[in-house]
């Protein structure tokens, strides 16, 4: 089987020109595309993978919602050669581009990643965005994660920071078949630098306090002690995916959107692929739109969502 | 139907400027890849620059890197190419071309730049 | 010099068949890229004649065809016909150049 091999990264690695062709290894009867995209109310960009699968042909869209971050994930299965070229990977365009200066800033202010590298979204470095309410829905909180896609033996992870409706969300997530977008929110100006080791903290539950030790106990240097256990106690990890239960009724709860789900034969992309030959694509620019006037994306293929803002 | 119209070609010293224009119909400017492609008098096709189709991916042939500059205005359906501290070598016509079907699917009729003293 | 190598020239008499080389390197052709082939008629822009290594875009009579094969490929035109004498360029991306690359381009002659 012969199968077309790329990956983007939001900038052109499956562009036009930047096609591959690659002949799978013994026992691959699939070619695999998968694109998932992510819009936030200052932008859009996606990521894309070509190559050898495994699996069963058939075709799976999702759409996703996590606190006004919209994903939307298409996969594509099947088994003829080269046929992994149906999904339209280029997002549609703008027309006019980038007229967000149309809306009213709410006073929130955040860093924006929309499909810049993980270098140039680091700390304080990426652009920094004034947050506005759109379509009714109020984005005061700032958001801090990552879009990972898995397809073809390949993983391709870029940050997302952005807007977003919750202020508290701690290593949330939503997630299709090898798709995952996930990370933490917080509330105040540019908070949003690093949340990657943000733990979660209810509103209902009262936080854990130090009281001061009797007097007639030792020095103070015991209440420093537990008090840096306390800290050094708390979770770190940001590989996991955690969904608050306590104070869910206080949150804005990621779901999947009203979208019909188009599963032909049970397209999945567990298993990863068995093809040999390099992949095309390098990170770099970023390929991204706003999205404040968009209709609907992608231009091609599969369900689509409709955009929240100025449509 | 598709249609790629260059415009901004001329005369011009060492040294000058010029501003290519691509007007382009029937498609979806916003949707496209494009590049600029030139051909020297008598010579072969040399790739000169390309630009996604949101305008932040861009990509420039050595020869012309640091002097010439793509962008284009997707309300106007229009390409551009910015083209500064010309030389001769740069003498040749300039085509538009749209990228699709992985390769350049559709072309303007092109426009002459002549770099001379 | 092109980065992808073609002979200057080729010709044949009408109703024969023709092949026109195009030789890469492990940065383009040899990595895998796909191949495409360009028709320019003289005095006009160029023309795509062949896509994805062997695809022909809707219009282009099935006398043309593509292949390719490691670090080559090849355009061959059968039961030639004068209005083929033209230019021929292959392109293909090129990963130490970042950007498409040409062929010199092969200039078809049809005699007789």
């Known amino acids: 089987l012969e199968c077309y091999s790329c990956v983007q990264k939001a900038d052109d690695g499956c562009s036009p020109h930047r096609m591959k062709t690659v002949k799978c290894g013994p026992g691959v009867d699939v070619c695999t595309e998968a694109v998932g995209a992510v819009e936030t109310i200052h932008g859009q960009f996606s990521v894309a993978v070509r190559g050898c699968g495994s699996g069963i042909p058939g075709k799976n869209d999702r759409g996703l919602d996590l606190h006004g971050l919209l994903a939307f994930f298409q996969l594509q299965q099947c088994s003829e050669d080269r046929c992994n070229a149906k999904l339209n990977l280029t997002l549609r365009g703008l027309n006019p581009a980038g007229n967000e200066s149309a809306y009213e800033p709410n006073g929130a202010e955040c860093y924006s990643c929309v499909g810049l590298s993980r270098e140039k979204c680091q700390g304080s470095m990426p652009p920094v965005v004034n947050c506005y309410n759109a379509s009714g829905r109020v984005y005061k909180g700032c958001f801090d994660g990552n879009v990972t896609l898995t397809a073809a033996n390949v993983t391709v992870s870029l940050p997302v920071r952005g807007c977003v409706q919750d202020e508290t969300c701690t290593r949330d997530g939503v997630t299709g078949p090898g798709f995952t977008l996930s990370g933490s929110c917080c509330q105040g100006p540019r908070c949003n630098a690093d949340l990657r080791n943000k733990t979660y903290f209810s509103p209902r539950i009262p936080p854990l306090v130090l009281l001061p030790p009797p007097t007639t106990a030792a020095p103070s240097t015991r209440a420093q002690n537990s008090s840096s256990t306390t800290s050094t106690a708390a979770p770190t990890t940001t590989t996991s995916i955690i969904k608050p239960t306590t104070a869910q009724a206080s949150h804005t709860s990621p779901h999947e959107m009203d979208l019909e789900v188009i599963q032909e034969e049970g397209a999945s992309l567990s298993g990863g692929a068995a093809g040999h030959g390099g992949t095309a694509g390098h990170g770099g620019a970023a390929g991204h739109q706003d999205r404040s006037n968009m209709e609907k994306y992608p231009g091609k293929g599969g369900a689509q969502i409709p955009a929240k803002g100025g449509s | 139907e598709v249609q790629l119209l260059e415009s901004g070609g001329g005369l011009v010293q060492p040294g000058g400027s010029l501003r290519l224009s691509c007007a382009a119909s029937?498609?979806?400017?916003?949707?496209?890849?494009m590049s600029w492609v030139r051909q020297a008098p008598g010579k072969g096709l040399e790739w000169v620059s390309y630009?996604?189709?949101?305008?932040?991916?861009?990509y420039y042939a050595d020869s012309v890197k640091g002097r010439f500059t793509i962008s284009r205005d997707n309300s106007k359906n229009t390409l551009y190419l910015q083209m500064n501290s010309l030389r001769a070598e740069d003498t040749a016509v300039y085509y538009c071309?749209?990228?699709?079907?992985?390769?350049?699917?559709?072309w303007g009729q092109g426009t002459l730049v002549t770099v001379t003293s | 010099q092109s980065v992808l190598t073609q002979p200057p020239s080729a010709s044949g008499t009408p109703g024969q068949r023709v092949t026109i080389s195009c030789t890469g390197s492990s940065s383009n052709i040899g990595a895998g890229y796909v191949v495409h082939w360009y028709q320019q008629l003289p005095g006009t822009a160029p023309k795509l004649l062949i896509y994805?290594?062997?695809k022909r875009p809707s219009g282009v009579p099935d006398r043309f065809s593509g292949s390719k094969s490691g670090t080559s490929a090849s355009l061959a035109i059968s039961g030639l016909r004068s209005e083929d004498e033209a230019d021929y360029y292959c392109a293909a991306w090129d990963d130490r150049l970042k950007g498409p690359v040409f062929g010199g381009g092969t200039k078809l002659t049809v005699l007789g």
């Open positions: 630009i996604s189709s949101s305008g932040s991916t861009i």
């Open positions: 071309a749209r990228e699709g079907l992985w390769a350049f699917d559709y």
């Open positions: 029937g498609f979806t400017f916003s949707n496209a890849w």
């Open positions: 994805d290594n062997n």
